[in-house]
Interface confidence: low
Amino acid sequence: SERCDDWGLDTMRQIQVFEDEPARIKCPLFEHFLKFNYSTAHSAGLTLIWYWTRQDRDLEEPINFRLPENRISKEKDVLWFRPTLLNDTGNYTCMLRNTTYCSKVAFPLEVVQKDSCFNSPMKLPVHKLYIEYGIQRITCPNVDGYFPSSVKPTITWYMGCYKIQNFNNVIPEGMNLSFLIALISNNGNYTCVVTYPENGRTFHLTRTLTVKVVGSPKNAVPPVIHSPNDHVVYEKEPGEELLIPCTVYFSFLMDSRNEVWWTIDGKKPDDITIDVTINESISHSRTEDETRTQILSIKKVTSEDLKRSYVCHARSAKGEVAKAAKVKQKVPAPRYTVELACGFGAT
């Protein structure tokens, strides 16, 4: 057969769907690879062909669109499962072609099982809510296109395993779930189950997301350097190890890049010839405020090193701060040797 532009296996789009639920999967060619959409392709006389390779097999085979109740069907650039089965797992290929043009891409589809509490290997999206920030909402995700607007589905929300009803600060409102005042206790997995009728059958869509309550922008402050500070002096003798921790607290800020770095005599450690190592550790509070510690270490400090300026810098979307460490050379203790011989026993 003639050459086909093969985009290979697009592992960036690892699609996961639940067993025994409808799934609609768009051909990724038009989303990410080609500069035209399906309508343009169709009107230009191009045909979209689907086939697949079963899990643990090498053989490409056509998709059976003649299953009872049209369990698998294609509509424009969408492959439909009504519903999925566990053994639908595999690599799916959509190919766009006519006599002179061909382009195809494959993508993995994994059909996963969930237990009665909605636990599954599904990778869950995380939705962050600000703590004590007034009313905030989450929306049942990825349900567009499953039923027409004339159909009114029933939506049931769960936290963990349990139906959300009569909760103090969480109110189901159709496709939305409203948090009146988000608290740490609201952290957890929330599931919406959307039930809708279609051609005399009832289908369920299960969508779970993780809610993480994070620090509010109302409470956000510029970085705070706890160490170095004015109370601690790093006093060393030449030859000893110099260890200076830089510990910085960052308020949680959505999409903020938190940075900590040292300068020695105004230069980054990489730009000078001293044998310096820097080790970083990061810890988070329950509301995702961050504490970063960078320990600057010079194994065998010289008297020259003890005269240098060591400054810890920190930056977030809220601002930039810096603090110098107090470093000095230890003064040797005076040696008291009394010359007792002097003035005694002289004859």
Epitope: E19, D20, Q113, K114, D115, S116, N166, V193, T202
Partner: antibody, heavy 120, light 107 residues
Framework: EVQVVESGGGLVQPGGSLRLSCAAS????????MSWVRQAPGKGLEWVAN????????HYVDSVKGRFTISRDNAKTSLYLQMSSLRAEDTAVYYC?????FGSGYFDYWGQGTLVTVSS | DIQMTQSPSTLSASVGDRVIITCRAS??????LAWYQQKPGKAPKLLIY???NLESGVPSRFSGSGSGTEFTLTISSLQPDDFAAYYC?????????FGQGTKLEIK
């Protein structure tokens, strides 16, 4: 050894009230959802209500909503069912049951039951 | 709420027989199903949870299968101690609901 023991059953007139208790031992009571399940004479099982570990969530079967209240005292490792506006159809053996691991919804330990008879 | 339909309601069998009890949910409950055994005057006893997981201490002649809406409890070789009532229970969505029960009696 896990044990749940119900008490408080008896004969009550229609419209009356009764409070059932369940004493739990042999497990960390505060870590488990707890439920009441009932069984009318010669009939099948019916789940009545359950309560979250800290008491912050309670769920009821529709037929008892507004009449029954489930509660717990973790310090006393006890579960309660306050029943009011009782009807003849509430006559049953009431079982206290522990739900499996967090929120699982199946019942791995049951008490022997306490009989509630609603009759005039 | 979800309805659970158990069949048969009564089952006559002999020691050594293979027995199958079925339970159908009015809508998909994934694998959120448990099976219980109950003897007269006694509390129910958990046999199977999550459709097919055998509760510890339950003889291996009991097994469960199914997912979605159709479930079965199988007793591979009936023993004298197995004559009792059996109930399925869903715990997937909404309130927990039990099947109406199957009475297993000696033929």
């Amino acid at each position: 050894e896990v044990q749940v023991v119900e008490s408080g059953g008896g004969l009550v007139q229609p419209g009356g009230s009764l409070r059932l208790s369940c004493a739990a031992s042999g497990f960390t009571f505060r870590s488990y959802w707890m439920s009441w399940v009932r069984q009318a004479p010669g009939k099948g099982l019916e789940w009545v209500a359950n309560i979250k570990q800290d008491g912050s969530e309670r769920h009821y079967v529709d037929s008892v909503k507004g009449r029954f209240t489930i509660s717990r005292d973790n310090a006393k490792t006890s579960l309660y069912l306050q029943m009011s506006s009782l009807r003849a159809e509430d006559t049953a053996v009431y079982y206290c049951a522990r739900e499996g691991y967090f929120g699982s919804g199946y019942f791995d330990y049951w008490g022997q039951g306490t009989l509630v008879t609603v009759s005039s | 709420d979800i309805q659970m339909t158990q069949s048969p309601s009564t089952l006559s069998a002999s020691v050594g027989d293979r027995v199958i009890i079925t339970c159908r949910a009015s809508q998909s409950i994934s694998r959120g199903l448990a099976w219980y055994q109950q003897k007269p005057g006694k509390a129910p006893k958990l046999l199977i949870y999550k459709a097919s997981n055998l509760e510890s201490g339950v003889p291996s002649r009991f097994s469960g299968s199914g997912s979605g809406t159709e479930f079965t409890l199988t007793i591979s070789s009936l023993q004298p101690d197995d004559f009792a009532a059996y109930y399925c229970q869903q715990y997937s969505y909404y309130s927990h609901t039990f099947g109406q029960g199957t009475k297993l009696e000696i033929k």
